[in-house]
Structure formats: structure tokens, C-alpha cells
């Protein structure tokens, strides 16, 4: 049951994370005008990965798309690529994980196949989350660099009457959405990988009949068996099974299974 819960939770967390990555990628507020020097501005600039916008104090908002591809900074292109790769991997991961869910029966799919699919989707979610976090972090780093450069420019070369005050940009909402979403996708992926360990037993449960020399009594217990000979100590080469009423999920038990989450 715990494995199913872990897998289901991992799926849901990853789903929310990927939805967040998509939202962040589409958002216009990756960078917003720094209002430190002028908190009441008549023109508020903000920029996304695909277009830049202006919200006028008159109440109107106008956006202009980046219609050039070659003219854009390489870093922006890299961020776009990372976010798109993250979305694609995440989407494929979601598709795979749907079929891997224990609560969904598809034909006579083996548990080992489900375990493999769970692991695959988990790895995809982890890479997807890392891509998103990397993309957002690269953009944030770019912003910080530009911020301090424009601050330096602001306080130099002001001898003339005309001040060409550069618009400084700071972190926009999309960055925080991206970081959180990437983190959730990553956590979801880790949970899927943990669930995979529970789905695929490391050793096979051999439920075959154990043959012994005649004359020895064999005691059976429900749910498996503990073969015990009359001699009592000859268990060296035998698999010992606990015959308690245990669910299929919990055949393998890892005491620290939930420490990873």
C-alpha cells in the first residue's frame, strides 16, 4: 500500500510541477522593472522568454514579441531550450507514469515492467526538474549581472545634463514559479524512483514445493511456507518466509524508505 501511495503521490507532485514549469515558461514576468528608485512609475516594464511588455499607468498593457531568433542573447536561447526540454521530458514522463501506476491495470502487465516504467518516468521527472531549475537559475544569474552593470552605469558618466537612466530589471514572479515547479518535479521524480524500488523485489519469491527426504514432517503456514525439518537446524540453503498477512506491496521492506522524501 505504501508503494502505491508513494507512486501516486510522486505522480501528482510531478504533475503539479510540470504544470508549473509550463506556466513559468509561458509567463511574461521573468524580469520586472526595479522600482527601488521610482516606486510610482507611469510605465512599468516586464519581460518574459517570448515577449516584453509595458503596463502603462493609464491602465493599458502592451506586449511586443521577440520576432527575431538570431538577434536574441545566447543565454535567453539557452533558457528557452532548457525550459522546453524540461516540459517535453516531463510530458513524456507523465505519459509513461500513467501506465506505470499500480492502481491502473493494463492487460497483464508484469510488476517488473511497471517498476521499469516507474523508474523511467522518475528519472525523466528528475531531469525535467533539473532543466527547469537550471533554466530559471541561468536567467536569474543573467538578471543579477545586468542589474549590477546597469547600477554601475547609472552612477557614472552623469556629468552632462541628460541622464540616460537605464531601466533596471529584477526577479519576476515566473522565476519563483519556475524554481518551485522544478523542485516539485524533482521531488516527484525521486518519489517515483523510491516507489520503483518497492515495486520490483530484488529477489524472487520462490513458492515452489520444497522436497525433503521421506520421514520428515513438513509444516506449512498460510501465505508462503516455512519448511522445517525434524532436525530443526538445517535451514542453511533454504529461503525463510514470514507467513504473516502482508500485502503484495510490502514484500520488501525498507525501514528508511520514506527518509528520502
Amino acid at each position: 500500500m505504501a508503494v502505491t501511495a508513494c507512486q501516486g503521490l510522486g505522480f501528482v507532485v510531478s504533475l503539479i510541477g510540470i504544470a508549473g514549469i509550463i506556466a513559468a515558461t509561458c509567463m511574461d514576468q521573468w524580469s520586472t522593472q526595479d522600482l527601488y528608485n521610482n516606486p510610482v512609475t507611469a510605465v512599468f516594464n516586464y519581460q518574459g522568454l517570448w515577449r516584453s511588455c509595458v503596463r502603462e499607468s493609464s491602465g493599458f498593457t502592451e506586449c511586443r514579441g521577440y520576432f527575431t531568433l538570431l538577434g536574441l542573447p545566447a543565454m535567453l536561447q539557452a533558457v528557452r531550450a532548457l525550459m522546453i526540454v524540461g516540459i517535453v521530458l516531463g510530458a513524456i514522463g507523465l505519459l509513461v507514469s500513467i501506465f506505470a501506476l499500480k492502481c491502473i491495470r493494463i492487460g497483464s502487465m508484469e510488476d517488473s515492467a511497471k517498476a521499469n516504467m516507474t523508474l523511467t518516468s522518475g528519472i525523466m521527472f528528475i531531469v525535467s526538474g533539473l532543466c527547469a531549475i537550471a533554466g530559471v537559475s541561468v536567467f536569474a544569474n543573467m538578471l543579477v549581472t545586468n542589474f549590477w552593470m546597469s547600477t554601475a552605469n547609472m552612477y557614472t558618466g552623469m556629468g552632462g545634463m541628460v541622464q540616460t537612466v537605464q531601466t533596471r530589471y529584477t526577479f519576476g514572479a515566473a522565476l519563483f514559479v519556475g524554481w518551485v515547479a522544478g523542485g516539485l518535479t524533482l521531488i516527484g521524480g525521486v518519489m517515483m524512483c523510491i516507489a520503483c524500488r518497492g515495486l520490483a523485489p530484488e529477489e524472487t519469491n520462490y513458492k515452489a514445493v520444497s522436497y525433503h527426504a521421506s520421514g520428515h514432517s513438513v509444516a506449512y503456514k498460510p501465505g508462503g511456507f516455512k519448511a522445517s525439518t525434524g532436525f530443526g537446524s538445517n535451514t542453511k540453503n533454504k529461503k525463510i518466509y514470514d507467513g504473516g498477512a502482508r500485502t503484495e506491496d510490502e514484500v520488501q521492506s525498507y525501514p528508511s524508505k520514506h527518509d528520502y522524501v
Epitope: 507611469a42 510605465v43 516594464n45 516586464y46 519581460q47 493609464s58 491602465g59 502592451e62 506586449c63
Partner: antibody, heavy 118, light 113 residues
Framework: QVQLVQSGAEVKKPGSSVKVSCKAS????????MNWVRQAPGQGLEWMGQ????????KYSGKFQSRVTITADKSTNTAYMELSSLRSEDTAVYYC???????????WGQGTLVTVSS | DIVLTQSPDSLAVSLGERATINCKSS????????????LTWYQQKPGQPPKLLIY???TRESGVPDRFSGSGSGTDFTLTISSLQAEDLAVYYC?????????FGQGTKLEIK
């Protein structure tokens, strides 16, 4: 069509207050900022402040911050500008003007002459 | 505050001739978000309120004759009347909508020579 009709001319004593009204018609009054601009005789234009009737938000020029109060009544589509502690240099024509796309003042009232004289 | 300085203070031009008025800003009026300059030109005839002519430095308001044109970017702007007509006798003001407080130039009086 958009129309802004202002109240009539006023003569005031120094130290008193004046309240000028601006009745809007022909557009959604609550959805646009309303500016107040003044022009002293033979002088240029001077922005005083603005109000967003939908929320009552206001922005004022630092020069008038302590003396001007801009209000709006959505039920009558009317904006008001009250200037207190009047002095002779406040003698001017006061205009209301709608704030529009591009941060421009596209429609103006006919103006209200306020004369401050002892 | 952004200071707008117009030049000249007054200008006398013959009918049919070109008139040019300049407006210089103490700060850039170019918005990075939409690459537009938040500079507006108004015309004020005696005894009338100002009338919007040009916004975003170069976009003509509907109904404004095409002899009026605006140009410039950043801090330097120009209003040009290509062929002066008698009805163009007025005072012309530039106004910035980039930053609060909103400010106007001191005005340029256009007279017929």
C-alpha cells in the same frame, strides 16, 4: 462622444479653499484615470494629480501633495479637485483631462478659472 | 522629476513654410518593454484647452492633419509642421508620460511671419 464639463469660474480669498467639479459623459468613467492640470495666466501647463474613479486611487504631484485633494463620485460620473490654503499665485485655469492609452490626456474639460484675490 | 526643455520659446514662420519645434528630456523616455517613447505633443489655441496631436513621439492622433509629424527617440524629440496653415497659430507643448510626476515643456509659441 466623450465630454468633460467643468464647473463655472470662482473668485476666492487667500487662505480659503476651492472645489472644482468635472462631469464626464460618453465613456466608462470608472475605467479611466482623470487628471487635473492647471495653467496660470500666460504660463505653461502644470500637472497636479489624478484619480482612478473605479478604486479611488490617487497620485499627486509633490508640489501640491499637501494642499490638493482629488475625489470622484461614480454615481454621478463626476471628479472633484479641491485646493486649500489658496494664495494669489494659485490664480489659474484648472483643467480636468482623461488619461488614455499611451499615458496621454486625450479629452480635456473647457477649464475653470479660479481667481484668488483679497 | 523629468525636465522637458522646449526650443525655441517662440517661432515665426511664413504660411506654407516648414516649422520645427524641439523638445529635450532630462532622462530617456524610451520604454524597453515596447520600444516606444512616452512623449506627447499638444496644441493649445488661445482661450481653448490643449488638444492632443501626437503620442508615442510619432503616432498621430486620429483627425490630426498629416502635415503634423513627430520624430525622435530617447531624449531628443521634434514636432514638424510641413506646411504651415493660418489655423496652426497656437502654443505647442510636449509632455512626458514615462514617469511621475507627469511634466510638460514650457511651451513654444508659433506665430505667422
Amino acid at each position: 462622444q466623450v465630454q468633460l464639463v467643468q464647473s463655472g469660474a470662482e473668485v476666492k480669498k487667500p487662505g480659503s479653499s476651492v472645489k472644482v467639479s468635472c462631469k464626464a459623459s460618453g465613456y466608462a468613467f470608472s475605467n479611466y484615470w482623470m487628471n487635473w492640470v492647471r495653467q496660470a495666466p500666460g504660463q505653461g501647463l502644470e500637472w497636479m494629480g489624478q484619480i482612478y474613479p473605479g478604486s479611488g486611487d490617487t497620485k499627486y504631484s509633490g508640489k501640491f501633495q499637501s494642499r490638493v485633494t482629488i475625489t470622484a463620485d461614480k454615481s454621478t460620473n463626476t471628479a472633484y479637485m479641491e485646493l486649500s490654503s489658496l494664495r494669489s499665485e494659485d490664480t489659474a485655469v484648472y483643467y480636468c483631462a482623461r488619461f488614455y492609452y499611451g499615458n496621454v490626456m486625450d479629452y480635456w474639460g473647457q477649464g475653470t478659472l479660479v481667481t484668488v484675490s483679497s | 522629476d523629468i525636465v522637458l526643455t522646449q526650443s525655441p520659446d517662440s517661432l515665426a514662420v511664413s504660411l506654407g513654410e516648414r516649422a520645427t519645434i524641439n523638445c529635450k528630456s532630462s532622462q530617456t523616455l524610451l520604454s524597453g518593454g515596447n520600444q516606444k517613447n512616452y512623449l506627447t505633443w499638444y496644441q493649445q489655441k488661445p482661450g481653448q484647452p490643449p488638444k492632443l496631436l501626437i503620442y508615442w513621439a510619432s503616432t498621430r492622433e486620429s483627425g490630426v492633419p498629416d502635415r503634423f509629424s513627430g520624430s525622435g527617440s530617447g531624449t531628443d524629440f521634434t514636432l514638424t509642421i510641413s506646411s504651415l496653415q493660418a489655423e496652426d497659430l497656437a502654443v505647442y507643448y510636449c509632455q512626458q508620460g514615462y514617469s511621475y510626476p507627469l511634466t510638460f515643456g514650457q511651451g513654444t509659441k508659433l506665430e505667422i511671419k
